[in-house]
Amino acid sequence: NIDVCKLGTVTVQPAPVIPLGSAANISCSLNPKQGCSHYPSSNELILLKFVNDVLVENLHGKKVHDHTGHSSTFQVTNLSLGMTLFVCKLNCSNSQKKPPVPVCGVEISVGVAPEPPQNISCVQEGENGTVACSWNSGKVTYLKTNYTLQLSGPNNLTCQKQCFSDNRQNCNRLDLGINLSPDLAESRFIVRVTAINDLGNSSSLPHTFTFLDIVIPLPPWDIRINFLNASGSRGTLQWEDEGQVVLNQLRYQPLNSTSWNMVNATNAKGKYDLRDLRPFTEYEFQISSKLHLSGGSWSNWSESLRTRTPEEEPVGILDIWYMKQDIDYDRQQISLFWKSLNPSEARGKILHYQVTLQEVTKKTTLQNTTRHTSWTRVIPRTGAWTASVSAANSKGASAPTHINIVDLCGTGLLAPHQVSAKSENMDNILVTWQPPKKADSAVREYIVEWRALQPGSITKFPPHWLRIPPDNMSALISENIKPYICYEIRVHALSESQGGCSSIRGDSKHKAPVSGPHITAITEKKERLFISWTHIPFPEQRGCILHYRIYWKERDSTAQPELCEIQYRRSQNSHPISSLQPRVTYVLWMTAVTAAGESPQGNEREFCPQGKAN
């Protein structure tokens, strides 16, 4: 704290504000009758330098002039940018115990003259907005610098406003708070910014613009859409705009899309007809405006209008498949399955499906509607049957899809050859095949059908299938394919009235099974041992089991066990072996093998054959 300079004064030459790199002389003078009481000659004036209130230097050695006991002049150099405080103190040297007494102080500011402001840019948001200009001030001056924005226009008028920069605030933008009106659309304006501080001044180059150059229209508002005759594909987009707008840009997209449809509309007057919308689709619409066809700026995009287009009747064809099971000698159960239409085909919420089963010759027709994607009926085994399914929404129904009901695997000559299933990655399987060798009739299409080989999957889960054109011999199946699960895959070849099929098992990823089969019984029949087992629980199989191995060795033997390898069949749960010695006790166990390796052994069972050895 500097007491109000009762003891003396401090002055700076050439000025308290100096350019970077300049030196200054600071003079400290005592007022008359001030100083050390006993001996004026003992008055010693010292100058202390503070930066950010921290003492950084005693300038005792920088004296350039000294009137002993009355005044001293100090030269200060190498001052850093910003403000530095100098405090003059009186030291009475005969009184060592008293601290120096403050006389007076001065602040010296070091800075630079302002650079000419550059890159002036002005905008007015909306026809009734206010003009705001921004600029680049250049290097920091470290001094209070005043900026004057001047805007000269028609009729000899100029407007101006000021702001300043210092160490607390920056001035590189000014809102004039006044508005350029559309009646000045053709007028030219000149804007310039002048900067001035204690070390100099500078002016920007004049920047010329017109009303149309700087006015950014307000974004359109009150956006709405009217669908003509409740059409799902045609609608009139309407909005409110500022009066001077001559050009609009419309963009719209389905909500899940990543690319916009763009439309330019000239003199739209707040209305535009769209003709290519997708029915029953959530759309987002936005509009931007411009005041001039060639010049000027686009407004910001309007707020989004989000709405769903109305429904239209479904289009496209349902993908139908079926399963046939004989119930007894004269009845069969037909289960029809179909895939949901994709949204662009459904064009609305599917309310129900119309299903028809028809016996072609006797003209028997069974009809029903269902909300599900499957339908099961028991029908006579005789006759030629055809099925059709169509999908209905609130606006109508799709054209029915027909399929002939044939015995899917009834014709051996139509069975595809060399069917293979290879895992491609974690979630798909590549199925390949060769065409039937001696088909009586032409293959119209192939159906690749797959189902997880788990208990009850035939009844619990509908099949998955792919339709393949007759000239293709491969399919990549991925729908509902999970790793470590074995799938039964069937390739059907269908002609007009017949079907043939081949079957294979496949998985997309495999590991060795978690455990081996559990031996439940060992029985002896006609000098052969029958080993019975329960299959490995489905979750522990971890892929397609290729074969089982039955191991046996004499109890307490250290020799390698013998083994018998059996091709895996889901239906098989026992197997004979015939190479065991009678009245020798054996230990038996089983393992299971997938393409990834062998399981740990299952339970061990001891058995001593009684019969005559082979």
């Epitope: 009734n128 226009g153 008028l157 101006q160 708070g177 006044i178 350029l180 009106s181």
Partner: nanobody
Framework: QVQLQESGGGSVQAGGSLRLSCAVS????????MGWFRQAPGKEREFVVA???????VYTNSVKGRITISRDNAKNAVYLQMNALKPEDTAVYYC???????????????????WGQGTQVTVSS
């Protein structure tokens, strides 16, 4: 009732200075644009300078550098400082007030809603 009262006019030698005041009652000066117009003998009233509510100054280029408008919100008054006066500055000076936000509107008489009675300024050579 809104009243504007000018004062500070008088006679002055060319090159001299005058400070005109406009005291306002019934409205707050900071909420309005405040303007000064003048009318020389035998001529139409013309725009001199104005200050918008946002403190932007608009002036006619013929008075640039010689005339300054200022506002004292505490006293609800507006001032016109005139320096380096010329004989052609002789006129009756009027203070005006209006809710104006447009660049051109600040120089248009018909945009101002309230006017003072005027104060005479005479500059002799």
């Amino acid at each position: 009732q809104v009243q504007l009262q000018e004062s500070g006019g008088g006679s002055v030698q060319a090159g001299g200075s005058l400070r005109l005041s406009c005291a306002v009652s019934g409205r707050t000066v900071s909420d309005y644009a405040m303007g000064w117009f003048r009318q020389a003998p035998g001529k139409e009233r013309e725009f001199v300078v104005a200050m918008s509510s946002s403190e932007t100054t608009v002036y006619t280029n013929s008075v640039k550098g010689r005339i300054t408008i200022s506002r004292d919100n505490a006293k609800n008054a507006v001032y016109l400082q005139m320096n380096a006066l010329k004989p052609e500055d002789t006129a009756v000076y009027y203070c005006s007030m209006g809710p104006i936000t447009t660049f051109q509107g600040l120089a248009r008489q018909n945009e101002y809603h309230y006017w003072g009675q005027g104060t005479q300024v005479t500059v002799s050579s």
